[in-house]
Interface confidence: medium
């Protein structure tokens, strides 16, 4: 059928709560795009009518709420003028009982479900809600090992909670909690995070943190200069490489004969507790084909990545 | 503490439809999903069907064309309808709750006796 | 569809004695999110059947430590210990993995 297919990485869900995926894939094409979400290669779209508990939200998928049984690969496809790309989501059901321990078999979690506090510092937690414009976020409560969190230590702001001076207590199981309002009705988002503290003074033994990227997307002119930056932080005494990559292979290799696109020289800024790194990636000229592919910034075990974009493509979901 | 209790008809004719209800205490629909179980002497216990918290179902494919489950979460109830009864869907019928976030069944009703006989 | 199947259909026991009852599952019951979904029961004469096992090894609440079960892909087991009188009836598997669920056809622990 003409379409490119693109495979993203599996996205594991809670059951009986709302869950929401963006299309975000931007297309190989200029103007108008239309966004169409399907089932399990399935000829029929999934609905638009916004009062099904599955209905697409302009570029979105929305599941009011997700449910045992919706477990399953859906496909977005992305339709240009002169171009079609086919992305395949891989949504898996998993039971998050955050409140109790003792039932255990909880998947690998994203680093979303997995955070991490830096005793002795202020830090914070951050509640992640990704859902479309449609859907209307009440206040964050956030809870402790199944309690309310109170106290002068934590504030809440907008989506993250702040900790002062973060001891070795604070860690556990942590749950941000918020109404979603969608069409007149109420659902409950409860998003478990497992917390733990680092007894290094700085950025959590030897993960890095990659402060940029941040698995977005960046709007470029087609033929542009364009250099991103990623920027790391790690321990004095890390062993970790930095670098980027695009289809699992180091850029330099993968653009070894044009080197149209390069890694550039990775520089450090030495803090009392901690290095800062910098390694960029540059793209001499942007070409049609580095639309929508994933660059990857990659830093020991920490990974992030940039989408090049067109500028303001109108999404109409057709 | 957790209850479910199931009522409904004790005897029904072949073809005609049987409707059970369950009633439920000590949980919420919006957050536990429903299951429907059945045991008779010759097939022992057969799993019938579930209603999910959020609203959907799954039933046995076995038995999928003459199967709805559904609720009323205003009222705590949930209800199983077959229709074309045989006199092989005379059975004890249970209802049973799921297990927290979790596909299976913790708590069972003490179950409806129910014969097809004309 | 999974069929379970259960061995020995009926086992006969002095009190006190180790039981050992044991499921097979014709494919394998990982749930595609990591976990195996099989439970047990116990069903005695005139009642519901009540929870013993459930995610092949965790004991319910109020379920003596004699219980155990163990096993992954498509073998499973579920041990007594030492067992008690109150332990007599019909045990049945069920899985929770693949639509539809299925139970086993029951074990009857009976005394000798």
């Known amino acids: 059928d003409g379409c490119k297919d693109i495979f993203m990485k599996n996205e594991i869900l809670s059951a009986s709560q709302p869950f929401a995926f963006n299309c975000t894939f931007p297309p190989i094409t200029s103007g108008e795009v239309s966004v169409t979400w399907y089932k399990n290669s399935s000829k029929i779209p999934v609905s638009k009518i916004i009062q099904s508990r599955i209905h697409q939200d302009e570029t979105w998928i929305l599941f009011l709420p997700m449910e045992w049984g919706d477990s399953g690969v859906y496909q977005c496809v992305i339709k240009g003028r002169d171009s079609c790309h086919r992305i395949h989501v891989n949504l898996t059901v998993f039971e998050k009982h955050w409140c109790d321990t003792s039932i255990g078999g909880l998947p690998n979690l994203s680093d979303e479900y997995k955070q991490i506090l830096h005793l002795g510092k202020d830090d914070s937690l951050t509640c992640h809600l990704h859902f479309p414009k449609s859907c209307v976020l009440g206040p964050i409560k956030w809870y402790k090992d199944c309690n309310e969190i109170k106290g002068e230590r934590f504030t809440v702001l907008e989506t993250r909670l702040l900790v002062s001076n973060v001891s070795a207590e604070d860690r556990g199981n942590y749950a941000c909690q918020a109404i979603l309002t969608h069409s007149g009705k109420q659902y409950e988002v409860l998003n478990g995070i497992t917390v733990s503290i680092t007894e290094r003074a700085g950025y959590g033994g030897s993960v890095p943190k990659i402060i940029y990227p941040k698995n977005h997307s960046i709007e470029v002119q087609l033929g542009t200069t364009l250099i991103v930056d990623c920027n790391v932080t790690d321990t004095k005494d890390n062993t970790n490489l930095r670098c980027w990559r695009v289809n699992n292979t180091l850029v330099d290799d993968y653009y070894d004969e044009s080197k149209r696109i390069r890694e550039g020289v990775e520089t450090h800024v030495s803090f009392r507790e901690h290095n800062l790194y910098t390694v960029n990636i540059t793209f001499l000229e942007v070409k049609m084909e580095d639309y929508g592919l994933p660059f990857m910034c990659h830093a020991g075990v920490s990974t992030a990545y940039i989408i090049l974009q067109l500028p303001a493509p109108d999404f109409r979901a057709y | 503490q957790v209850q479910l209790k199931e009522s409904g008809p004790v005897l029904v004719a072949p073809s005609q439809s049987l409707s059970i209800t369950c009633t439920v205490s000590g949980f919420s629909l919006t957050k536990f999903g429903v299951h429907w179980i059945r045991q008779t002497p010759g097939k022992g216990l057969e799993w019938l069907g579930v209603?999910?918290?959020?609203?959907?179902?799954n039933y046995n494919s076995a038995l999928m064309s003459r199967l709805t489950i559904s609720k009323d979460i205003s009222q705590s109830q949930v209800f199983l309808r077959i229709d074309s009864l045989q006199t092989d869907d005379t059975a004890m019928y249970y209802c049973?709750?799921?297990?927290?976030?979790?596909?299976?069944?913790?708590?069972w009703g003490q179950g409806t006796s129910v014969t097809v006989s004309s | 569809d999974v069929l379970l199947t259960q061995t020995p259909l009926s086992l006969p026991v002095s009190l006190g004695d180790q039981a050992s009852i044991s499921c097979r599952s014709s494919?394998?019951?990982?749930?595609?999110?990591?976990?195996?979904?099989l439970q047990w029961y116990l069903q005695k004469p005139g009642q519901s059947p009540k929870l013993l096992i459930y995610k092949v090894s965790n004991r319910f609440s109020g379920v003596p430590d004699r219980f155990s079960g163990s096993g992954s892909g498509t073998d499973f087991t579920l041990k007594i210990s030492r067992v008690e009188a109150e332990d007599l009836g019909v045990y049945y598997c069920?899985?929770?993995?693949?639509?539809?669920?299925?139970f086993g056809a029951g074990t009857k622990l009976e005394l000798k």
């Open positions: 209603i999910w918290a959020g609203g959907p179902t």
């Open positions: 069920f899985q929770g993995s693949h639509v539809p669920f299925t």
């Open positions: 494919q394998n019951i990982v749930h595609s999110n990591g976990n195996t979904y």
């Open positions: 049973a709750k799921q297990i927290y976030y979790s596909t299976l069944v913790d708590y």
